[in-house]
């Protein structure tokens, strides 16, 4: 993913105290790999700012150089700034690392807008607020970039957590997570809880606030309520899944389900918005407009450009519908649905109106590269990337923003036939034509 409509990192509200959490609805203990229960050292290890990405602290080299790294499930390279740049406070200095090894190979990654290029090498990497291990990993040292780093975002690199198939320059470059699992006893699973603020943050609050958790090697039960529902990873490149039905306030969009996955549907922590294929986006917006017709909003708002402002604390959440995506289940002809609130798809934006107003951007947008379940979706849920079992789990996040009337939900099972037909089969083309940009 790269931030074009990149993800909001709206730092997070902590979840309720454990005593207030909903009980597990079912016991899936035996089905989940990895360490059980508490990963207290990894909780709250993500930070960030609205629309600019969630990042984790990492160290690279010997002696360790500390960098903030964007967590991106929509790409597969570990790449860090390695030369001075106006937007970087610090960067990886290979010459200061006694453990750096040059691979004598370059890498060039173009996006729809912008690019980065660099030199490949390996070095020792660890995650201070992660597992207590150090691994030798491939690193792309970014020497030149355009519209990649973001002014004030506070991150200096990107951690691509997807599969080798989409790594650059080719799939022979082992991604960080593969290296981590190979070189340690850490189970092949990680999970993300991205916590949106739900209200505009001023500069100070945004810098200070917690963004969420990346749990490496398992699942932390304190981060979600209810049960986890799993959808198969269709193919190990992006984290590709299959959407079988879409509803707005319970009203089926009634489209051929192939449209929902044209040309793919992915879970991408490095994208801000819920991005939908053109036809689906148009139908969804029409339906959302109809549901919220007591008020009319400008065309530019639905394009994600204009911001709508309300008196602080008076945002009429109730006039906006919920959005439900039905995902293929693990059992034949069974699906489950994830439901997000306007508190997820209206993204708070700071510094535009007076302090007496709350202003929001519409964070559902059009895509030419398939559905992208970005932060707008992920901020509602605890998302488990169970690579070992080739599945992705969703449960209601303990930190999601909601009101007294509605909450995000993960519900099932639902009977859905012929779900395999919902997947789109991309015609095989030369790998160099793959779209890298997710703007």
């Amino acid at each position: 993913t790269h931030l074009g409509i990149r993800l909001p990192l709206r730092s997070g509200l902590a979840g309720p105290p454990l005593g207030l959490r909903l009980p597990r609805e079912t016991d899936e203990e035996s089905e989940e790999p990895g360490r059980r229960g508490s990963f207290v050292e990894m909780v709250d290890n993500l930070r960030g700012k609205s629309g600019q990405g969630y990042y984790v602290e990492m160290t690279v080299g010997s002696p360790p150089q500390t960098l903030n790294i964007l967590v991106d499930t929509g790409s597969s390279n570990f790449a860090v700034g390695a030369a001075p740049h106006p937007f970087l406070h610090r960067y990886y200095q290979r010459q200061l690392s006694s453990t750096y090894r040059d691979l004598r190979k370059g890498v060039y990654v173009p996006y729809t807008q912008g690019k980065w290029e660099g030199e490949l090498g390996t070095d020792l990497v660890s995650i201070p607020h992660g597992p207590n291990v150090t691994v030798r990993a491939n690193i792309a040292a970014i020497t030149e970039s355009d519209k990649f780093f973001i002014n004030g975002s506070n991150w200096e690199g990107i951690l691509g957590l997807a599969y080798a198939e989409i790594a650059r320059p080719d799939d022979s470059l082992e991604p960080f997570f593969d290296s981590l699992v190979k070189q340690t006893h850490i189970p092949n699973i990680f999970s993300l809880q991205l916590c949106g603020a739900g209200f505009p943050l001023n500069q100070t609050e945004a810098l200070a606030s917690v963004g969420g958790s990346m749990i490496i090697g398992g699942i932390d039960h304190s981060l979600y309520t209810g049960r986890l529902w799993y959808t198969p990873i269709r193919r190990e490149w992006y984290y590709e899944v299959i959407i079988v039905r879409v509803e707005i306030n319970g009203q089926d969009l009634k489209m051929d389900c192939k449209e929902y996955n044209y040309d793919k549907s992915i879970v991408d922590s490095g994208t801000t918005n819920l991005r939908l294929p053109k036809k689906v986006f148009e139908a969804a917006v029409k339906s959302i407009k109809a549901a919220s017709s007591t008020e009319k909003f400008p065309d530019g708002f639905w394009l994600g450009e204009q911001l709508v402002c309300w008196q602080a604390g008076t945002t009429p959440w109730n006039i906006f519908p919920v959005i439900s995506l039905y995902l293929m289940g693990e059992v034949t002809n069974q699906s489950f649905r994830i439901t997000i609130l306007p508190q997820q798809y209206l993204r708070p934006v700071e510094d535009v109106a007076t302090s007496q107003d709350d202003c929001y951007k519409f964070a559902v947008s059009q895509s030419s590269t398939g559905t992208v379940m970005g932060a707008v979706i992920m901020e509602g849920f605890y998302v488990v990337f169970d690579r070992a079992r080739k599945r992705i789990g969703f449960a209601v996040s303990a930190c999601h923003v909601h009101d007294e009337f509605r909450t995000a939900a993960v519900e099932g099972p639902f009977v859905t036939a012929d779900m395999e037909d919902c997947g789109y089969n991309i015609p095989q083309t030369d790998e160099s034509t793959l779209m890298t940009g997710r703007a």
Epitope: T294, K296, G300, L307, C309, V352, C359
Partner: antibody, heavy 120, light 108 residues
């Protein structure tokens, strides 16, 4: 051709409530394509947005005036109204009613304006 | 809050001359900017919307340009009726609310 016409008293006493009505002729206030609003201009000064209203009665107000302003709509009379309470001399201005068009983002049609003086 | 600053405050020109008016936003407003003309004793009228689109009935000598934070209203050749006050207004934040302080174009 659609026209807007403000009406109401030209003189209001301090601490009282200013009340103005805008009558829409040549078109319907119930159109889904527009909001309707009020803008004022103190003598010799710039333009200040007061607030806007949709046919459903949904309103938006200038934060600096919010505690004193009420805008309402009467679709049966094709009118919308402004009430501004607890007025002072600083509220003396020409008050314009406007249509908010062009993607409900710009003030594309204006009434002629009415001068309201706040004085005892 | 987005603040619009217009310059110059007053522009003294002769008929037939070219007028260039500036409006600067304190942060990007994309292309969501309009220009209005107000003659003495009259209500303002919309000239340009979305930075560069002429409103209905506006002569071609009026043109708008710019995006982001810097915008320009150009009157290619001033006619006697063009001497007036010009205001810019942004609508990136909605409902539309923010006007610039105005530029007076007067006869030299």
């Amino acid at each position: 051709q659609l026209q807007l016409q403000e009406s109401g008293p030209g003189l209001v006493k301090p601490s009282e409530t200013l009340s103005l009505t805008c009558t829409v002729s040549g078109g319907s206030i119930s159109s889904s394509s527009y909001y309707w609003g009020w803008i004022r201009q103190p003598p010799g000064k710039g333009l200040e947005w007061i607030g806007s209203i949709y046919r459903s009665g949904s309103t938006y107000y200038n934060p600096s005036l919010r505690s004193r302003v009420t805008i309402s709509v009467d679709t049966s009379k094709n009118q919308f109204s402004l009430k501004l309470s607890s007025v002072t001399a600083a509220d003396t201005a020409v008050y314009y009613c406007v249509r908010v068009g062009h993607g409900i983002s710009y003030f594309d049609l204006w009434g002629r304006g009415t001068l309201v003086t706040v004085s005892s | 809050e987005i603040v619009l600053t217009q310059s110059p405050a007053t522009l003294s020109l002769s008929p037939g001359e070219r007028a260039t008016l500036s409006c600067r936003a304190s942060q990007s407003v994309s292309s969501y900017l309009a220009w209005y003309q107000q003659k003495p004793g009259q209500a303002p009228r919309l000239l340009i919307y979305d930075a560069s689109n002429r409103a209905t009935g506006i002569p071609a000598r009026f043109s708008g340009s710019g995006s982001g934070t810097d915008f320009t209203l150009t009157i290619s050749s001033l006619e006697p009726e063009d001497f007036a006050v010009y205001y810019c207004q942004q609508s990136l934040t909605w409902p539309p609310r923010t006007f610039g302080g105005g530029t007076k174009v007067e006869i030299k």
